[in-house]
Interface confidence: low
Amino acid sequence: TLNSVLNSNAIKNLPPPLGGAAGHPGSAVSAAPGILYPGGNKYQTIDNYQPYPCAEDEECGTDEYCASPTRGGDAGVQICLACRKRRKRCMRHAMCCPGNYCKNGICVSSDQNNFRGEIEETITESFGNDHSTLDGYSRRTTLSSKMYHSKGQEGSVCLRSSDCATGLCCARHFWSKICKPVLKEGQVCTKHRRKGSHGLEIFQRCYCGEGLSCRIQKDHHQASNSSRLHTCQRH
């Protein structure tokens, strides 16, 4: 199963790697900065979008947030709404689409460099710094694109999802990134948590496949936050 190259989804959503409140470290998709592979309502259109009732952001898809559908509406009636794209207004990070965060009321790009110090600090705090490197190599991965003569198979090292074979995405595994399978219906997925709330995800899963979104299992609605399982479900 650890590199510190950050993907844009992970910047927005930093789940607890060590059993924090969320208990869902690691899904999302590994991508090169600026390249997004979101799940959620990626394949939805306004025409087929079915409102999904929710109580909190974590019950919605990756590209959604939980809010009242009308401004100043009844707080008791909340549904999953499509995330806000870059330069759109926002009130909190969760409202912004993967790869963005809420700054001064506007969704702005999560430039990897802006977060590097914060993230490395989080890594050390949450996972411990008892690993070592050999031969003076840096911990940061420096994969060269010339490595990739053929598409990576499951478990092989990658830099971005395009380095992986069809049906696989590039996702974090400890400090490395490896090709992992895109998730199918019923498979466990990870609900993204919000920037700054928890530690960096040590593991990631791929996103749910086409026509699927990562949602809380119906029979887990009553469970505590820490034990909730999310699975890939049909829209």
Partner: antibody, heavy 118, light 112 residues
Framework: QVQLVESGGGLVQPGGSLRLSCAAS????????MSWVRQAPGKGLEWVSS??????????WYAAGVKGRFTISRDNSKNTLYLQMNSLRAEDTAVYYC?????????WGQGTLVTVSS | DIALTQPASVSGSPGQSITISCTGT?????????VSWYQQHPGKAPKLMIY???NRPSGVSNRFSGSKSGNTASLTISGLQAEDEADYYC???????????FGGGTKLTVLG
């Protein structure tokens, strides 16, 4: 197909040293994490150590009980994984498995027995 | 130290279903939805049967399935067959010095 073959096990006295080797074939060795997992006679599996691929800086990880005594390394040109074991103790007696750490330990060797006894 | 707790043994008759539990803490199994299960026949190397809680590697029978709730993961084997008799180990990740943790193993006996 993926093959992992361990060697180098044997009988050694407490305080002694051994170097285990694992010859890999059937996959791009340099692109995968590799690990050692051991199993004491009649006991369960215990993770020992892991090493990343070159491009992640050959980062190494060790279980608390072996840290400072064992050293994992790899030679990608020879498709070989190593475990240098120093200051061996009776409790290190086990079958040592070399495992490819793709998505978890997806391929294992057949193991090599290390016996530490006076 | 065994980080994850499994029953020492379970048994079932051919055709039946059995479930093996694996219990950890919020620092290991409960903190990661990354649980794997391995099958080990006597004198043989372990074989990966389930990864990421409920995913089967290619070549593994769909009679094997996994699940997880809170700090406990489960492996269910349906339509039990004689060749399923083996030791089964769960594995997860953990904080602290030990990054990878295994359960103590469960011996599955297929009766009859």
């Amino acid at each position: 197909q993926v093959q992992l073959v361990e060697s180098g096990g044997g009988l050694v006295q407490p305080g002694g040293s051994l170097r285990l080797s694992c010859a890999a074939s059937g996959f791009t060795f340099s692109s995968y994490w590799m690990s050692w997992v051991r199993q004491a006679p009649g006991k369960g599996l215990e993770w020992v150590s892991s090493i990343e691929h070159k491009d992640a800086g050959y980062t190494t990880w060790y279980a608390a009980g072996v840290k400072g005594r064992f050293t994992i390394s790899r030679d990608n040109s020879k498709n070989t994984l190593y475990l240098q074991m120093n200051s061996l103790r009776a409790e290190d007696t086990a079958v040592y498995y070399c495992a490819r750490h793709g998505i978890d330990f997806d391929h294992w060797g057949q193991g090599t027995l290390v016996t530490v006894s006076s | 130290d065994i980080a994850l707790t499994q029953p020492a043994s379970v048994s079932g008759s051919p055709g039946q279903s059995i479930t093996i539990s694996c219990t950890g803490t919020s620092s290991d199994l409960g903190g990661y939805n990354y649980v794997s299960w391995y099958q080990q026949h006597p004198g043989k190397a372990p074989k990966l049967m389930i990864y990421d809680v409920n995913n089967r590697p290619s070549g593994v029978s769909n009679r094997f399935s996994g699940s997880k709730s809170g700090n406990t993961a489960s492996l269910t084997i349906s339509g039990l067959q004689a060749e399923d008799e083996a030791d089964y180990y769960c594995q997860s990740y953990a904080s602290g010095n030990t990054k990878v943790v295994f359960g103590g193993g469960t011996k599955l006996t297929v009766l009859g």
